[in-house]
Amino acid sequence: KLTIESTPFNVAEGKEVLLLVHNLPQHLFGYSWYKGERVDGNRQIIGYVIGTQQATPGPAYSGREIIYPNASLLIQNIIQNDTGFYTLHVIKSDLVNEEATGQFRVYPELPKPSISSNNSKPVEDKDAVAFTCEPETQDATYLWWVNNQSLPVSPRLQLSNGNRTLTLFNVTRNDTASYKCETQNPVSARRSDSVILNVLYGPDAPTISPLNTSYRSGENLNLSCHAASNPPAQYSWFVNGTFQQSTQELFIPNITVNNSGSYTCQAHNSDTGLNRTTVTTITVYAEPPKPFITSNNSNPVEDEDAVALTCEPEIQNTTYLWWVNNQSLPVSPRLQLSNDNRTLTLLSVTRNDVGPYECGIQNELSVDHSDPVILNVLYGPDDPTISPSYTYYRPGVNLSLSCHAASNPPAQYSWLIDGNIQQHTQELFISNITEKNSGLYTCQANNSASGHSRTTVKTITVSAELPKPSISSNNSKPVEDKDAVAFTCEPEAQNTTYLWWVNGQSLPVSPRLQLSNGNRTLTLFNVTRNDARAYVCGIQNSVSANRSDPVTLDVLYGPDTPIISPPDSSYLSGANLNLSCHSASNPSPQYSWRINGIPQQHTQVLFIAKITPNNNGTYACFVSNLATGRNNSIVKSITVSASGTSPGLSAGA
């Protein structure tokens, strides 16, 4: 089918375009080009007769068109008006006609844009600014850049008018930036020069420096005022409400006590019409005053609060010193001094930080000390301790339990027996106890300041007969030559003797065995596999005795160096090779084999049927104990000889 391709489709003004014809029929008489989508004699550009090779211009011919023998049409020095459709009319030799239409678009080289603004000096938090990208150009795309970045997403930024207008609502000082606009069409892109938005703002609340408000008589007073403002603020100073001068700095030499008072700085912005003031109170001392300590937290909570201790008053050109517990400050990451040493901050206070704290002001002759300050650190309650530690009593004795928990303020105590409240005292006394007094004894400690409570529960057994003891262990699976194990005989009972047996025998004498805690605890240091025995503890008093069930110690060990059996190393070709590996280990190890360094199977036995000399090599057995984390291995060389070459060789399994 006859088609027209425009090369290029988007044409820049002044350039050229080729209307390229595809699938031109054979045996042609001639062809004509027309402007538009149909054949119209009034809009003929050019005609061409093949026989005469004669080109004839038509009414729409501009002198910029060239027709080629292959029917393609070149249009040079393109103008905007050339945009649109072009129709080729082909007349075949049999006078049958055929038509095809193509098109292209003409775009101008864009002019350099510029930015116009509706407000050259917008006021912060009050005005909006609309930037418009000029000129308005047909078929152009508009983009905006802020500080050479694409537009940020903001509800205060709005694009309109086909993106040609950028509006900033409620401008802020942060909108002071470089703004550029860009125009694009398919054949060019242009960028404007930058426009800097000048936002008027302020003045903010002025800052008076230096911050210190206490001075000595005879010093110079030099105060400086600054307020963020655009344009820069105009400053005025007032002392006790009386105007002094219109300067940014106020200087008074050789001040006296009479210069004490309120000093006001006023900042004024003539463009925004706004005023802001800041007042500082200056105190002039005839002599250095006695310092005193102020605290930002009089009742700090342990491990929660920080405390800032400040040495008052603030005096210019003064050295501040600190003491804790009558010593100079210790080095600690929890102690921080401010740059001027006037403030000492204790980070995450503890109960040990109570003090006393003193600060001092150094003058020419001596150091003036403050009165000591003690911190009231609130802490606790810690877990209460119930004493005595016995859990087993005989009927008829008196039960006297005492509870204590470290706490500030001191804890309030409550006793519960089997969950039932008994009394709100620190001590619990029950005379002449019976078996019915057995149960769970709970002490509850409460700190009213922090609101925290902690409890401890103790099981009390009242019985004429001693209970059957049991053994508790601090390590159920110790590793050989590494761990220690402590066995404890439970329960702890009053006026009771504790005894131990190992495999039914009394304890052997050994430097690795140690009794402690009134023989209640048996410790085995550096356990070995030989310590894997049955341990029994016994308790006895004047009326009864009892023994625990045995506890067998499960010592983890190995793997030891493995043994490969059978021990033979020479085999005849054709025999079966059946190697077994064994290593002493608890728990049993995992086995794996390697032949000449190449991993084989993860089994204890390695079997190879009908071996040949190709099976010569090193056979390694690897053992691994996952519980101890230890490994071991052994290597065996195997030689396989051809059948009948050497007498006396093993025939294999």
């Epitope: 080289e109 350099k112 694009q184």
Partner: nanobody, 123 residues
């Protein structure tokens, strides 16, 4: 002002590929639109491709469309031209050009030019 140095030229067989680079220094790279032009011996300087400041707009000469790709890396201050399916008629000295306010096919719109890198397409 910006200085431009082209690299990556060489001899390549027809159908082969090359990647040209243009390293910029002396100014903020993202403030310039960039273009590639070429000049074969005895011929006029010819537009190849152009890219705008942010890299979102590109423009190609019809003779290279679909075969060449222009791109830029503002973080590395570098312009690239990936040339695929090279033809003998692509043989030329390739120039990199820069403009603060223009991107397009008109060489007069670019005030800054590199020295060029030679591309030869030959079997």
């Amino acid at each position: 002002e910006v200085q431009l140095v082209e690299s990556g030229g060489g001899v390549v067989q027809p159908g082969g590929s090359l990647r040209l680079s243009c390293a910029a220094s002396g100014h903020t790279f993202s403030e310039y639109a960039l273009g590639w032009f070429r000049q074969a011996p005895g011929r006029e300087r010819e537009f190849v491709a152009a890219i705008n400041w942010g890299g979102g707009w590109t423009y190609y000469a019809d003779s290279v469309k679909g075969r060449f790709t222009i791109s830029r890396d503002n973080a590395k201050n570098t312009l690239y031209l990936q040339m695929n399916s090279l033809r003998p008629e692509d043989t030329a000295l390739y120039y990199c050009a820069a403009s603060s306010d223009y991107a397009g096919g008109n060489p007069t719109g670019y005030p800054y030019w590199g020295q060029g890198t030679l591309v030869t397409v030959s079997s």
